[in-house]
């Protein structure tokens, strides 16, 4: 390897070496290295093999090191952002309103008007804007799957608030799924969690775009907060690695 | 600020300046700066702006960009497992076997020999092996919080599997709490997801440790893969960062 | 990525991990861990090019800044990026201990 | 940490992360970017002692080890930690745009 | 002030048996292996054996097994080291060391002489 | 058993002087080779462990080097307090074993 003066690579091996001396003592908060006289004999307990195996073994379900950002997503995203089709639609007469559930649907064709291939979205939220909520409520976030059955996403516990709040959650994969599909209404369900044995399953939370009865001006305004997807994507002439410095559209 | 040689901090304020330059101009893959003639006098349009605002506000369940490493992470955790209470234990008799749920608990004064204090707990998991699965299932974890009643803690999408795989839950803030009360047993609940509507809750998974008649070698081996809580802590002699170079106990 | 799968197979000379594994008896003379008996640590090493500066051709570096020094610094240094814990089996007195030590293990390096 | 709360505001010589406000219009002569006008970048600057060799009197190190060279670098280097995303907006031509840079802005550094 | 306090000088016959006391303060007396050395007249330093206070787990040197006795009383925080069937080049001054597991003895006692004569 | 073998048995020298002693053992000990200083009447002190670590409140004229089997303890400027016997002790293996002593005494 060379910059300016040449790389003594032995040299830089000796000193990281040397380095990892004092890296494995100081995390250890060892003056200087155990002494091995009173080490009992023969192998390592089973135990405590055991016990470094399991250390060292990733298990499912267990977060890995953070991956390194992968070169994409160095470059800039475009923001844009779909709201909800609105409630009047004829697609919400589909589902029965219940006391634990509301839904939400997107056309997916403005979906695509604004990430023309799944390949260039690099995040996708769903924000709703939650009331005032008075008591603690866990709710899940469900995908529409086929006719009338639905995938499970995620869940939040929502503490109590005086005052509105946007939730995000984070539906990437959905989305890209979407946009590969050909589909031209999907949509989510935001339920109470019900447990097994528990009998009181109302979703108490209040939406923002579900309320009824509004007239005039508040009702835009409403309209205007009704849940909406957030994207971020690669624009496609970025993607396409042009080498023309031209500003495209 | 002097090194060897005196540092310019209006050099290395220039140099990075013009690093910007770069830095923006490259990840939005542009040549040079768009040209601004074609651009509609007056402010932004209130969309463009709202769009910003929202990209610009964290919103409630975003993550945050991750926080640096605490001091404390920086040094080596000393790595012990405490097992489950043995299923045959009469805590158990207390909770009825149902299709649904099954349970673990644990004896606190176990926890409290390996993690003497709760701010040295840096980190706890459940870990459990589940034996081989046909179906898709998901999972819930509960703690149990008083007492008949049990707290959500997180959930699991298991994949249909072949195999045995350790299962892992971050349970760090749970077993924090118990290391801080005065319980002599404290416990968890896997279940079954239940969905609001959903008359099929029976929990399909097969826990190692729960399975019934097993006999000699056998039910020691599976015995000792049975659930257990596996423990990172700071060492008591550790924390108290004394300026002595001992190598305590 | 500058990672392990890359700069392992390529002659890169800029930024890159480096192959390095210790062997904890033979590199640092130490008996006194008992598993692992050496691991991969790796380190980051060689240049990375400033290519940013008013009188330079914008185009032309503009492929090239993401790699050399996409955190905009004044002097960009090559560094770890992913790094992975290690844990430890080693004796205090006659007492086996298993301890952790977080971010031992580079697996990817960066200009930052 | 070495972060903004406590850079600035006490007079560390050492790595650490320093205060940059780059407003786009006075430093960078562009009138491009409609919003914001300007953002806190920062950036890390100052020495990270190599503190370790085979003669170094190890109880004397340990305690400054994690802040110079928590990585083990053989030649450790102060950079940015924690960094934050800065959304733009842009015309180009008559269209506006919201776009999101990742790691624009240094909250913290450190010597890797 | 971490402090090792021993018992003051003995004389004693041949086939006699002598023991030493040796007071530990300043420190959890627990959490540390004692160790006796001892030093005869004009000679280094020889290591008889260890005992670990918490579990009153001991080891000796082959050349005292079975003439010496360790043994502690967690409530005082002292250890004993009894040595049995003396002979005249037992004649020596006795020393509980503190043991630190980077391998080195960090605080000693004051030494105790003791003279066996007939 | 690890036998270690202190060179020279005594020593005479000036205040001011720089001193050498060295320790040699029958076989490779991993730097665990400690030095302590007795004074007659004095508890025995501990001056270097881990071969080159210098105990809390030890003068830094005191230093410690080597590796392997050969291990070296110097004293760089004597002061009148310095003059006592020292002795090596190796940590590596059971049992522990002492070298026989060097005395230092004023020229």
């Known amino acids: 390897l060379s910059t300016c003066k040449t790389i003594d690579m032995e040299l830089v091996k000796r000193k990281r070496i040397e380095a990892i001396r004092g890296q494995i003592l100081s995390k250890l908060r060892l003056a200087s290295p155990p002494s091995q006289g009173e080490v009992p004999p023969g192998p390592l307990p089973e135990a405590v093999l055991a016990l470094y195996n399991s250390t060292r073994d990733r298990v499912a379900g267990e977060s890995a090191e953070p991956e390194p950002e992968p070169e994409a997503d160095y470059y800039a995203k475009e923001v844009t952002r779909v709201l909800m089709v609105e409630t009047h639609n004829e697609i919400y007469d589909k589902f029965k309103q219940s006391t634990h559930s509301i839904y939400m649907f997107f056309n997916t064709s403005e979906l695509r008007e604004a990430v023309p291939e799944p390949v260039l979205l690099s995040r996708a939220e769903l924000r709703l804007l939650r009331l005032k909520l008075k008591v603690e409520q866990h709710v899940e976030l469900y995908q529409k799957y086929s006719n009338n059955s639905w995938r499970y996403l995620s869940n939040r516990l929502l503490a109590p608030s005086d005052s509105p709040e946007w939730l995000s959650f984070d539906v990437t994969g959905v989305v890209r799924q979407w946009l590969s599909r050909g589909g031209e209404i999907e949509g989510f369900r935001l339920s109470a969690h019900c447990s097994c044995d528990s009998r009181d399953n109302t979703l108490q939370v209040d939406i923002n775009g579900f309320t009824t009865g509004r007239r005039g001006d508040l009702a835009t305004i409403h309209g205007m907060n009704r849940p909406f997807l957030l994207l971020m994507a690669t624009p496609l002439e970025r993607a396409q690695h042009l080498q023309s410095s031209r500003h495209r559209r | 600020l002097s090194t060897c040689k005196t540092i310019d901090m209006e050099l290395v304020k220039r140099k990075r300046i013009e690093a910007i330059r770069g830095q923006i101009l490259s990840k939005l893959r542009l040549a040079s700066p768009p040209s601004q003639g074609e651009v509609p006098p007056g402010p932004l349009p209130e969309a463009v702006l709202a769009l910003y605002n929202s990209t610009r506000d964290r919103v409630a369940g975003e993550s945050a960009e991750p926080e640096p490493e605490p001091e404390a992470d920086y040094y080596a955790k000393e790595v012990t497992r405490v097992l489950m209470v043995e299923t045959h234990n009469e805590i158990y008799d207390k909770f009825k076997q149902s299709t649904h749920s099954i349970y673990m608990f644990f004896n606190t004064s176990e926890l409290r020999e390996a993690v003497p204090e709760p701010v040295l707990l840096s980190r706890a998991e459940l870990r459990l092996l589940r034996l081989k699965l046909k179906v898709e299932q998901h999972v819930e974890l509960y703690q149990k919080y008083s007492n008949n009643s049990w707290r959500y803690l997180s959930n699991r999408l298991l994949a249909p599997s072949d195999s045995p795989e350790w299962l892992s839950f971050d349970v760090t803030g749970v077993v924090r709490q118990w290391l801080s009360r005065g319980g002599e047993i404290e416990g968890f609940r896997l279940s079954a997801h239940c969905s609001c509507d959903s008359r099929d809750n029976t929990l399909q998974v097969d826990i190692n440790g729960f399975t019934t008649g097993r006999r000699g070698d056998l039910a020691t081996i599976h015995g000792m893969n049975r659930p257990f809580l596996l423990l990172m802590a700071t060492p008591l002699e550790r924390a108290q960062h004394l300026q002595s170079s001992r190598h305590r106990r | 990525a500058l990672d392990t799968n890359y700069c392992f197979s390529s002659t890169e000379k800029n930024c890159c991990v480096r192959q390095l594994y210790i062997d904890f008896r033979k590199d640092l003379g130490w008996k006194w861990i008992h598993e692992p008996k050496g691991y991969h640590a790796n380190f980051c090493l060689g240049p990375c090019p400033y290519i940013w500066s008013l009188d330079t051709q914008y185009s032309k570096v503009l492929a090239l800044y993401n790699q050399h020094n996409p955190g905009a610094s004044a002097a960009p240094c090559c560094v770890p990026q992913a790094l992975e814990p290690l844990p430890i089996v080693y004796y205090v007195g006659r007492k086996p201990k298993v301890e952790q030590l977080s971010n031992m293990i580079v697996r990817s390096c960066k200009c930052s | 940490a070495l972060d903004t709360n406590y850079c600035f505001s006490s007079t560390e010589k050492n790595c650490c992360v320093r205060q940059l406000y780059i407003d786009f219009r006075k430093d960078l002569g562009w009138k491009w970017i409609h919003e914001p006008k300007g953002y806190h970048a920062n950036f890390c600057l100052g020495p990270c002692p190599y503190i370790w060799s085979l003669d170094t009197q190890y109880s004397k190190v340990l305690a400054l080890y994690n802040q110079h060279n928590p990585g083990a670098s053989a030649a450790p280097c102060c950079v940015p930690q924690a960094l934050e995303p800065l959304p733009i907006v842009y015309y180009v031509g008559r269209k506006p745009k919201v776009e999101q840079l990742s790691n624009m802005i240094v909250r913290s550094c450190k010597c890797s | 002030e971490v402090q090792l306090v021993q018992s003051g000088a003995e004389v004693k016959k041949p086939g006699a048996s002598v023991k030493v006391s040796c007071k530990a303060s300043g420190y959890t007396f627990t959490s540390y292996d004692m160790h006796w050395v001892r030093q005869a007249p004009g000679q280094g330093l020889e290591w008889m054996g260890r005992?670990?206070?918490?579990?009153?787990?001991?080891k000796y040197a082959q050349k005292f097994q079975g003439r010496a006795t360790l043994t502690v009383d967690t409530s005082t925080s002292t250890a004993y080291m009894e040595l049995s069937r003396l002979r005249s080049d037992d004649t020596a001054v006795y020393y509980c060391a503190r043991w630190d597991y980077g391998g080195y003895f960090d605080v000693w006692g004051q030494g105790t002489l003791v003279t066996v004569s007939s | 058993d690890i036998q270690m073998t202190q060179s020279p048995s005594s020593l005479s020298a000036s205040v001011g002087d720089r001193v050498t002693i060295t320790c040699r053992a029958s076989?490779?000990?991993?730097?665990?080779l400690n030095w302590y200083q007795q004074k007659p009447g004095k508890a025995v002190k501990l001056l270097i462990y881990y071969t080159s670590v210098l105990e809390t409140g030890v003068p830094s004229r005191f230093s410690g080097s080597g590796s392997g089997t050969d291990y070296t303890l110097t004293i760089s400027s004597l002061q009148p307090e310095d003059f006592a016997t020292y002795f090596c002790?190796?940590?590596?293996?059971?049992?522990?074993?002492f070298g026989q002593g060097t005395k230092l005494e004023i020229k």
């Open positions: 076989q490779d000990i991993y730097n665990y």
């Open positions: 002790q190796q940590g590596d293996e059971l049992p522990w074993t």
């Open positions: 005992i670990d206070p918490q579990s009153g787990g001991v």
